[in-house]
């Protein structure tokens, strides 16, 4: 028998320094968890006490924090290339600057495996990305090889910005010539490796003939056996095994998100490469666990260049930015219309001649906006004015609702209207009436939707039983503020861009803003 | 564009060892294996070993194994072979080589005549 | 080790002609072969991998095909630049072997 030891994470998002329990800012150092130095620090007592091991990445390492925001993508070459990581996936994040913010960055500086079987590139690009990204890589370990197969959710252009000369293909229908091939070269153990979320991952298990191993990401799903060490909720057993439709055992896992764990799989092989067992954990990588003095200090050097660039101008504002409670917990405040506007705008894709764009809605609790910014400051905006105004470093992410689950969503927002609670609902694309003179659930009197299959965007009304694409931030997709309904009733869940970053890109590209008050959000007469 | 420089030509007397370098550039070097092959006067292709600078992982073709070195320098990009207990059968040119994906050869150093002669 | 064998082990042709190499291995070696050209002096070059695929940049008159143990290189339309040394390769096992080669020369 051989044993294989598999370190993996996924979906780190930009959190290269440590960060608290809940993945934001790390404010008391001696509980805060994760970075690429403390990860360092287990990986290498890991490398020395074990002789066969591989380290690898699920994708989604871009996005998600002022590192990527500066530094697009040079700074997870530069760590990984440092931490000497195997082989990596391509995640729908490794899009968001486009193709050439993942070529140059990236792809060509990345000193291990970039890996995906089913994005193929067309047009000029072809020659241009040739070679820089594969569908697989066979690599060596002890006296034996091990294939890796990479995959990438074939959501993404709707997700980030691939371009049009990329196509992503079904995952399992371009998977299986790619594993067919390494079973040619002799290569008889062979580890999927990919970024589709975890219900794919044991869909390829199940389906894909002689992957022996799937190592998923995307779903940012925690797995694992035993007592968890922290505050995720397992979503199953560490590994997740998946009976194939050939019969055999298959490891499936996965190792949350945010680099808090580093998912750890020992795999044992007979002569033939078949699977004998398969255990292990992800290791909560809390203080307990040193970081690496030198890879500590190249962080803190790194560090410089992003205090300097949150005192920037990203762009002006010529009106008042009202980001008060007093305001977004109770109507419509031109704050909140701000920052849903750059939601849509960030997620504008145009991959479809019958849309104008996949998704024209957007919802944001007022609780979320925490300050407003004035514009008697020269109408300077700079990061740090909007990490003020979104100090959670929340994603904004895409969701699929049934009408009725949005329409609960507005009942919620006002049944405990007056109150200054923040699950008070900022909005765009939405056009809503309340009458706060009804009942409790049943305030919303008229609920109107921008359409998408049109070439003239305009208002309809809600349809209960139709499906729309939302953008909202992931603490609502959670249900967070009481929005129970969103998370039980969704029906498709992508994390999408930091929320300051979508913001700060916005007022980039427009150069000077003046949001205002239009009547997205209205209460009906004799009632307010 | 992919390039692999070999060193010139050595000639060695028997019982000596000799160690022969290929600059890779054009590409990231860490990334692909490289393989050694040497071919006799009037021979076939032979394959020597081969190098994953990755992870710095070494194989050897059995026949080879124990008088064959090979190593890497990551930071210079470069790969070396050094055959050790020389005999004039092992006169030859040795090429290093890259693979496009893993076990075939998909560019090719110059080739690096090695000559044994007492 | 798989065995590699040729044939011929040489022949002559003409410009324009169609030409036919083949290999045998000594086991399955299933589609993993791959086909070089040699010009004295000079490393070999790649021209085809996976039994039928054809490297960049290689003309469309090469030709590959075969699996398991039989294996053949076709050009179509013999250019005055291809006579050379031919060796097929397996790609398939480590230790990696090549056929013994074909050499093509001007009739």
């Known amino acids: 028998a051989w044993e294989l030891t598999i370190l993996h994470t996924n979906d780190v998002h930009s959190r290269l320094e440590q960060t608290s329990e809940d993945s934001s800012k790390c404010v008391n150092a001696s509980r805060c968890m994760g970075g690429v130095a403390r990860l360092f620090t287990k990986v290498q007592q890991i490398r020395r006490a074990e002789p066969n091991v591989l380290l690898l990445d699920a994708g989604d390492q871009y996005q998600g924090t002022i590192w990527f925001t500066v530094y697009k993508g040079a700074e997870v070459a530069h760590f990984m290339n440092a931490l000497r990581y195997d082989a990596m996936a391509l995640g729908n994040h490794e899009f968001d600057n486009g193709v050439e913010g993942l070529i140059e960055p990236l792809l060509k500086e990345a000193k291990f495996p970039i890996l995906s079987a089913n994005i193929k590139a067309k047009g000029p690009l072809a020659s241009q990305i040739s070679g820089l990204y594969l569908p697989y890589k066979v690599l060596p370990v002890g006296d034996e090889v091990v294939g890796i197969v990479g995959y990438t959710s074939k959501e993404t252009p709707f997700l980030s910005n691939p371009g049009t000369n990329l196509v992503f293909e079904d995952e399992i229908t371009a998977l299986q010539p790619e594993v067919d091939k390494l079973k040619t070269l002799n290569v008889n153990k062979i580890i999927a490796l990919g970024h589709s979320g975890f219900e794919m991952d044991k869909l390829i298990a199940q389906k894909v003939r002689g992957v022996d191993v799937v190592v998923g990401g995307h779903s940012n799903t925690f797995l694992y056996t035993g007592n968890p060490p922290s505050k995720e909720v397992p979503a199953g057993k560490y590994p997740f095994i998946v009976t194939s439709d050939d019969g055999r055992k298959v490891p499936v896992v996965q190792a949350y998100a945010f680099g808090k764990y580093l998912g750890y799989l020992k795999i044992e092989f007979d002569e033939r490469g078949n699977v004998i067992s398969s255990h292990g954990n992800p290791i909560l990588l809390n203080s307990s666990i040193p970081e690496d003095p030198s890879i500590k200090a190249d962080i803190n050097k790194w560090r410089i260049k992003l205090d300097n660039y949150s005192t920037q101008e990203l762009g002006k504002t010529i009106v008042y930015l009202d980001g008060s409670s007093q305001s977004c917990r109770f109507r419509e405040c031109n704050m909140g219309n701000l920052i849903c506007d750059a939601m849509i705008n960030n997620n504008l894709r145009h991959t479809d001649e019958m849309f104008w764009n996949h998704v024209s809605m957007c919802i944001l609790n007022g609780g979320g906006i925490r300050s407003p910014i004035d514009e008697r400051n020269n109408g300077t905006i700079t990061w740090e004015n909007l990490a003020a105004v979104l100090p959670f470093g929340g994603t904004f992410d895409l969701v699929q609702l049934k009408g009725s689950t949005l329409k609960k969503a507005f009942e919620h927002s006002v049944h405990r209207y007056g109150q200054s609670t923040g699950e008070f609902l900022q909005v765009g694309g939405i056009h809503v009436v309340y009458d706060l003179s009804r009942k409790p659930g049943d305030r919303v009197v008229k609920l109107d939707v921008l359409c998408t299959k049109c070439r003239v965007p305009s208002y309809d009304p809600l349809k209960m039983d139709e499906v729309y694409k939302v953008i909202l931030p992931n603490f609502l997709a959670n249900g967070g503020d009481g929005f129970q309904m969103i998370k039980d009733e969704l029906l498709r869940h992508d994390s999408g861009d930091q929320d300051i970053n979508v913001v700060s890109t916005y007022i980039s590209k427009m150069k000077v803003i003046y949001p205002a008050v239009e009547g997205r959000i209205k209460f009906s007469t004799g009632s307010h | 564009q992919v390039q692999l420089v070999q060193s010139g030509a050595e000639v060695k007397k028997p019982g000596a060892s000799v160690k022969v370098s290929c600059k890779a550039s054009?590409?990231?070097?860490?990334?692909?294996?490289i393989y050694w092959v040497r071919q006799a006067p009037g021979q076939r292709l032979e394959w020597i070993g081969w190098?994953?600078?990755?992870?710095?992982?070494?194989k050897y073709n059995e026949k080879f194994k124990g008088r064959s070195t090979l190593t890497a320098d990551k930071s210079a990009s470069t790969a070396y072979m050094e055959l050790s207990s020389l005999r004039s059968e092992d006169t030859a040119v040795y090429y290093c080589?890259?693979?496009?994906?893993?076990?075939?050869?998909?560019?090719w150093g110059q080739g690096t005549l090695v000559t044994v002669s007492s | 080790d798989i065995q590699m064998t040729q044939s011929p082990s040489s022949l002559s042709a003409s410009v324009g002609d169609r030409v036919t190499i083949t290999c045998k291995a000594s086991?399955?070696?299933?589609?993993?072969v791959a086909w070089y050209q040699q010009k004295p002096g000079k490393a070999p070059k790649l021209l085809i991998y996976?039994?039928?695929t054809r490297h960049t940049g290689v003309p469309s008159r090469f030709s590959g095909s075969g699996s398991g143990t039989d294996h053949t290189l076709t050009i179509s339309s013999l250019q005055p630049e291809d006579f050379a040394t031919y060796y097929c390769?397996?790609?398939?096992?480590?230790?990696?072997?090549f056929g013994q080669g074909t050499k093509l020369e001007i009739k």
């Open positions: 080589a890259r693979d496009d994906n893993y076990a075939w050869f998909a560019y």
């Open positions: 086991q399955d070696v299933s589609t993993a």
């Open positions: 190098i994953y600078p990755g992870n710095l992982n070494i």
């Open positions: 390769q397996q790609h398939y096992s480590t230790p990696f072997t």
């Open positions: 054009g590409y990231t070097f860490t990334n692909y294996y």
């Open positions: 996976w039994t039928n």
